[in-house]
Amino acid sequence: EEELQVIQPDKSVLVAAGETATLRCTATSLIPVGPIQWFRGAGPGRELIYNQKEGHFPRVTTVSDLTKRNNMDFSIRIGNITPADAGTYYCVKFRKGSPDDVEFKSGAGTELSVRAKPSAPVVSGPAARATPQHTVSFTCESHGFSPRDITLKWFKNGNELSDFQTNVDPVGESVSYSIHSTAKVVLTREDVHSQVICEVAHVTLQGDPLRGTANLSETIRVPPTLEVTQQPVRAENQVNVTCQVRKFYPQRLQLTWLENGNVSRTETASTVTENKDGTYNWMSWLLVNVSAHRDDVKLTCQVEHDGQPAVSKSHDLKVSAHPKEQGSNTAAENTGSNERNIY
């Protein structure tokens, strides 16, 4: 009778993560009597995957009933495959021995490759906000995919970006891989509504790439422009001074009125109007009584935006002037108006 051979017909098996792998093995003879064991890897450090004789292997089932006397099919199924299961699996026939069974013959091995999907890309921007014309960096990370080949693209509002660097780790063989990419984006004043998108394509995704997004609204700071104007209102001795705060983002803004350098009033932007580009406008005003003034008054609108150093705009109020013919009195009727008498 010919000596027993252990046949593993599949050189390699490719399985998607989460699925079941079938590893085939047959023996050409029933003798010598003895059990079959499955190992991952070879040599002294090999890992026992299944032992016909004893042990608990909850993820492993046998294809046929190994307790049957004439069974020569030692194929197994491994459930819920993960990238960590990748490797070469050997079906090994033992002969009965004492005190331990003795390895008799091994199959040639079956390489199990695991296809694992990348995790959803996570895009993160800079820790601090930046202003238009500045270049900021965005990072994109995705993990746990296999095989190593992967494609990553960056987009800003649908337009592909070219200024980015990507690394896939580790460089050598591994059960699964991670990708890390950094893209540089130049901010513009119109970017409040913009999005940066990281798109990852992998063989496991069947042409339906994964995307991670970052809203530039989290990154950009558009500093306001200020304009201070005066208008006459109702009585000849009252002047309405307005401070127009335009095109700012984010909304966090504090305005202080100074009269000849002294703090007159501080308020926080609340009832703002939003522009189409996502920036905000806000207006604050003072009703100034000039009748008691002998000298000119210097009014300053000082704005602290998003914790940045204050910017200001001043307006000189001439007390000798009679501005009754300028503008209209509509601002005085605004419910947000604030009267301020100067003595």
């Epitope: 003879s29 003798i31 010598p32 009597v33 003895g34 004893e54 069974n71 009965k96 021995g97």
Partner: antibody, heavy 120, light 107 residues
Framework: QVQLVQSGAEVKKPGASVKVSCKAS????????IVWVRQAPGQGLEWMGW????????NYAQKLQGRVTMTTDTSTSTAYMELRSLRSDDTAVYYC?????????????WGRGTLVTVSS | DIQMTQSPSSVSASVGDRVTITCRAS??????LAWYQQKPGKAPKLLIY???NLQSGVPSRFSGSGSGTDFTLTISSLQPEDFATYYC?????????FGGGTKVEIK
């Protein structure tokens, strides 16, 4: 025909030795183990030991250790069991059997038995 | 050593009866249990291996079940030729041990 043929009955005096043979035919001798089991008159079955016909490795029952030796001759497909320093309580029918389980031990083919009587 | 305890030690039954013999191992032996039939002056004969597998040529009225420590041999309809002594045997590890036997006698 698959069978195990044992040697004939023996009468021995206490302190003597006995060697029982078991000749296999009809199958590949080296593919299976051989066990020896004895049965004293009116008693149950007692496992004595096991030998690999492939490599000659052995495993003996603790109580017989030092008195029993099991061997094989692959050229004649024969297994032997020698028991030394015989005592009267060694009087029994001695069976050889083929051990056929893959990852366990069970015995699917038995010899007819050899009666060994130890008497002064 | 693994002790094998068989019960009952004897049972009286009639032809056609259903007979159940139990065997308990002192520790878990998975499914590595065999059952043998022995008639007077004859060698034991393997009936069941690996707890529940019927040995080739054995009538289907014999069946085995159990795993771990508790096992059962059932003869579904006793026949005249079934009057004999039955032994269980653990085959999980050395030393191999047998139960004390159950004698099935004619009522």
């Amino acid at each position: 025909q698959v069978q195990l043929v044992q040697s004939g009955a023996e009468v021995k005096k206490p302190g003597a030795s006995v060697k029982v043979s078991c000749k296999a035919s009809g199958y590949t001798f080296t593919g299976y183990g051989i066990v020896w089991v004895r049965q004293a008159p009116g008693q149950g079955l007692e496992w004595m030991g096991w030998i690999s016909a492939y490599a000659g490795e052995t495993n003996y029952a603790q109580k017989l250790q030092g008195r029993v030796t099991m061997t094989t001759d692959t050229s004649t497909s024969t297994a032997y069991m020698e028991l030394r320093s015989l005592r009267s309580d060694d009087t029994a029918v001695y069976y050889c059997a083929r051990e056929a389980g893959s990852s366990w031990y069970d015995f699917d083919l038995w010899g007819r038995g050899t009666l060994v009587t130890v008497s002064s | 050593d693994i002790q094998m305890t068989q019960s009952p030690s004897s049972v009286s039954a009639s032809v056609g009866d259903r007979v159940t013999i139990t065997c308990r191992a002192s520790q878990g032996i998975s499914s590595w249990l065999a059952w043998y039939q022995q008639k007077p002056g004859k060698a034991p004969k393997l009936l069941i291996y690996a707890a529940s597998n019927l040995q080739s040529g054995v009538p289907s009225r014999f069946s085995g079940s159990g795993s771990g420590t508790d096992f059962t041999l059932t003869i579904s309809s006793l026949q005249p030729e079934d009057f004999a002594t039955y032994y269980c045997q653990q085959g999980a590890s050395f030393p191999i041990t047998f139960g004390g036997g159950t004698k099935v006698e004619i009522k």
